[in-house]
């Protein structure tokens, strides 16, 4: 009933709780002398379903047959309407539509840990939409029984609050769950189990790792477990990996040696436990232990390259470059690099430790045979040294690779191709492709990049440190014993017309011709490799087309003569630059009048 129902009653037949699809009869009847004044025909009883009118009747009672009610609760309210007055609430009723409980499925029980309590879960099946009570029953040896009830609306878990002990691990226990509501009842199939079947050990705790003599090859994992644990499984992985290594161990008694860990690597370790070989379930995984393995001396050898630069008749500058070892080769934090420079005939040697850099520059005499050795050191030792004999890398013209080309290959890649040298191609032991940003003036501080290619390759894709709209000087070296030959080319991964033209800084007269000098276009405005400069000139105040002279681009060139100007005529001159994508805008304009004699 919704309220006190002083004025009348609402009755529901056959029941307030009905099976989905059933019909109900709702009757609203006024109590004596509770209708409208005057006479009963004025009474108008109105039936509401929630807040909407669905039926009416004139008189002392209203009878309504209702079908098709949805699952859940529907509220019906009866009101009385009299002429010239507001409706008066008479009474109401809630009707609960649902279904009988389905048979609970997949009943399973576990006890978490040897000291834990037995708890069971099951699948309720479809929602009954009605108040449904679940009773869980457990029976054991010696006619012992335990019972627990659950009155939750969505009940699918109950904890008995009792602890099974290992005194008789093979004793049978049987659990059963029964669901009851107003429309029926249903019981699960019984689930029978022993102590060993349902006790799920607590996850191992207090996990530690020890490295004997700070060595990765002598590593032991320690942990603590509940007393009855027989089996463990260990899983571990480098912290940056998604794949686990898995190990199963029996009777480990809280320790296990690991033999395949990599040095100087952070690992994550987890352990799980089980009481019996084929009964029961594994514990949850333990909390993770994270630990870094000790360093080992580096393996592998550094990839070393060098550049020679002539200083004067007696001295040359050597710049050495090397690449970092990979993490798996470094096997620790590289503390320094050891560079040894040795004159091979006189035996003089100089050793230097270098930290924080992967390059080294020194000046040596141009005479003598020089060699360098470079190794990387961590706290445990050094890598094997990489030895290189310093030679003139481009001296052997017959070893120079032929038909070198450089083409853009997608975003920020350049494909370099070449043909083997004329000299017996089988003499080539390896190719080295070297590239660096092109800087007029040949700035030696510009980073050098290189890659090595097998002797049977005739192409290499370079992508490391390649930027769009930058021109690179690319060299291909063919190395054979203590000889080398090289060829070079300019290349870019992406280009467009330069953003500005060269700036003419001077025009000088020399024997009837002029010499134009200009400043290079700033690198960031070149927008790729320059192919040509153009010098334009025309008579001042003339509307005629300008004449032009096109000069192939050379890195160091910044002046050019022109000898086709007429004396005592004032000319306007300007310059542009071209890449493969097009021509720049004009540089500055300069006026000039040649003073020489007329022919």
């Amino acid at each position: 009933k919704i309220d006190a129902c002083k004025r009348g009653d609402v009755t529901v037949k056959p029941s307030h709780v009905i099976l989905l699809g059933s019909t109900v009869n709702i009757t609203c009847s006024l109590k004596p002398r509770q209708g409208c004044f005057h006479y009963s025909r004025r009474n108008k009883l109105i039936l509401y379903k929630f807040d909407r009118r669905i039926n009416f009747h004139h008189g002392h009672s209203l009878n309504s047959q209702v079908t098709g009610l949805p699952l859940g609760t529907t509220l019906f309210v009866c009101k009385l309407a009299c002429i010239n007055s507001d409706e008066i609430q008479i009474c109401g009723a809630e009707i609960f539509v649902g279904v009988a409980p389905e048979q609970p499925q997949n009943l399973s029980c576990i006890q978490k840990g040897e000291q834990g309590t037995v708890a069971c879960t099951w699948e309720r099946g479809r929602d009954t939409h009605l108040y449904t009570e679940y009773t869980l029953q457990l029976s054991g040896p010696k006619n012992l029984t335990w019972q627990k009830q659950c009155k939750d609306i969505y009940c699918d878990y109950l904890d008995f609050g009792i602890n099974l002990t290992p005194e008789s691990p093979e004793s049978n226990f049987t659990a059963k769950v029964t669901a009851v509501n107003s429309l029926g009842s249903s019981s699960s199939l019984p689930s029978t189990f022993t102590f060993l079947d349902i006790v799920r050990p607590l996850p191992p705790w207090d996990i530690r790792i020890k490295f004997q003599k700070a060595s990765v090859s002598r590593c032991t994992l320690y942990w603590r477990d509940e007393g009855l644990v027989l089996l463990n499984r260990l899983r571990y992985r480098p912290s940056n990996s998604r794949l686990w290594n898995m190990v199963n161990v029996t009777k480990a008694k809280g320790r296990h040696d690991l033999l395949d860990l990599k040095p100087f690597t952070e690992y994550e370790f987890q352990i799980s436990s089980k009481l019996h070989l084929y009964k029961g379930s594994w514990s949850d995984w333990s909390e993770s232990l994270r630990a870094q393995t000790p360093e080992e001396e580096p393996t592998g050898m550094l990839d070393v390259w060098y550049m020679k630069r002539h200083i004067d008749y007696s001295r040359q500058q050597i710049s050495l470059f090397w690449k970092n070892l990979s993490v798996s080769e470094a096997r620790g934090k590289i503390l320094h690099y050891q560079v040894t420079l040795q004159e091979l005939t006189g035996g003089k040697a100089m050793t230097q430790n270098i930290t924080g850099h992967t390059s080294w520059t020194t000046v040596i005499p141009r005479t003598g045979n020089w060699a360098v050795a470079v190794s990387a050191a961590n706290s445990k030792g050094s890598s094997l040294p990489t030895r290189i004999n310093i030679m003139n890398l481009c001296e052997a013209g017959l070893l120079a690779p032929r038909q070198v080309s450089a083409n853009s290959e997608g975003m920020d890649n350049i494909l370099v191709t070449w043909q083997p040298p004329r000299k017996d191609p089988s003499a080539v032991q390896e190719y080295v492709v070297e590239w660096r940003e092109l800087h007029p003036g040949g700035d030696t501080q510009v980073p050098l990049n290189w890659l090595r290619s097998r002797p049977y390759n005739v192409s290499a894709l370079i992508s490391e440190n390649i930027k769009s709209y930058i021109c690179y000087e690319i060299r291909v070296y063919a190395l054979s014993g203590d000889q080398g030959g090289c060829s070079s080319i300019l290349g870019n991964s992406k280009h467009k017309a330069p953003l500005s033209g060269p700036h003419i800084n001077a025009i000088t007269e020399e024997k009837g011709s002029i010499l134009i000098s200009w400043n290079s276009i700033p690198v960031q405005e070149q927008m790729g490799c320059l192919l040509h400069y153009r010098i334009y000139w025309k008579e001042r105040d003339s509307n005629s087309q300008p004449q032009l002279c096109e000069i192939p681009y050379r890195v160091s060139q910044n002046s050019h003569p022109i000898n086709s100007l007429q004396p005592r005529v004032t000319y306007v001159l300007w310059m542009t630059a071209l890449t493969a994508a097009g021509e720049s805008s004009h540089g500055n304009e300069r006026e000039f009048c040649l003073q020489g004699k007329a022919n």
């Epitope: 909407r52 009118r53 669905i54 039926n55 009416f56 009747h57 004139h58 008189g59 209203l62 009878n63 309504s64 047959q65 209702v66 079908t67 098709g68």
Partner: nanobody, 123 residues
Framework: QVQLVESGGGLVQPGGSLRLSCAAS????????MSWVRQAPGKGLEWVSA????????SYADSVKGQFTISRDNAKNTLYLQMNSLKPEDTAVYYC????????????????WGQGTQVTVEP
């Protein structure tokens, strides 16, 4: 889904008769009281008549009392309106709808409405 389809409208001379029908589907017709409402050209909605779910109680607007008769056949899921002695002021579109009350303002819900049938009374 809910469907109410009115029929039986048309052009009739003053004093003539028409019988409107409304075929219901998509809901449990016998659960609900039903109504006829009308809308004359350029006017608002006007409640005409109502009948309860089992047909034992009816109500009429004063303007049509004694002239119109509402009835229903739950077996056929059909609502009827018998209109006699028709007058030009009865010209309107007639709608069949789930009963919401006996005043024009009760009909704010449009979820149980038909598309209407036109009745025109003119000499």
């Amino acid at each position: 889904q809910v469907q109410l389809v009115e029929s039986g409208g048309g052009l009739v001379q003053p004093g003539g008769s028409l019988r409107l029908s409304c075929a219901a589907s998509g809901f449990t017709f016998s659960n609900y009281a039903m109504s006829w409402v009308r809308q004359a050209p350029g006017k608002g909605l006007e409640w005409v008549s109502a009948i309860n779910s089992d047909g034992t109680s009816t109500s009429y607007a004063d303007s049509v009392k004694g002239q119109f008769t509402i009835s229903r056949d739950n077996a056929k899921n059909t609502l009827y309106l018998q209109m006699n002695s028709l007058k030009p002021e009865d010209t309107a579109v007639y709608y069949c709808t789930k009963w919401e009350g006996d005043t024009d303002s009760d009909y704010k819900f449009k979820d149980y409405w038909g598309q209407g049938t036109q009745v025109t009374v003119e000499p």
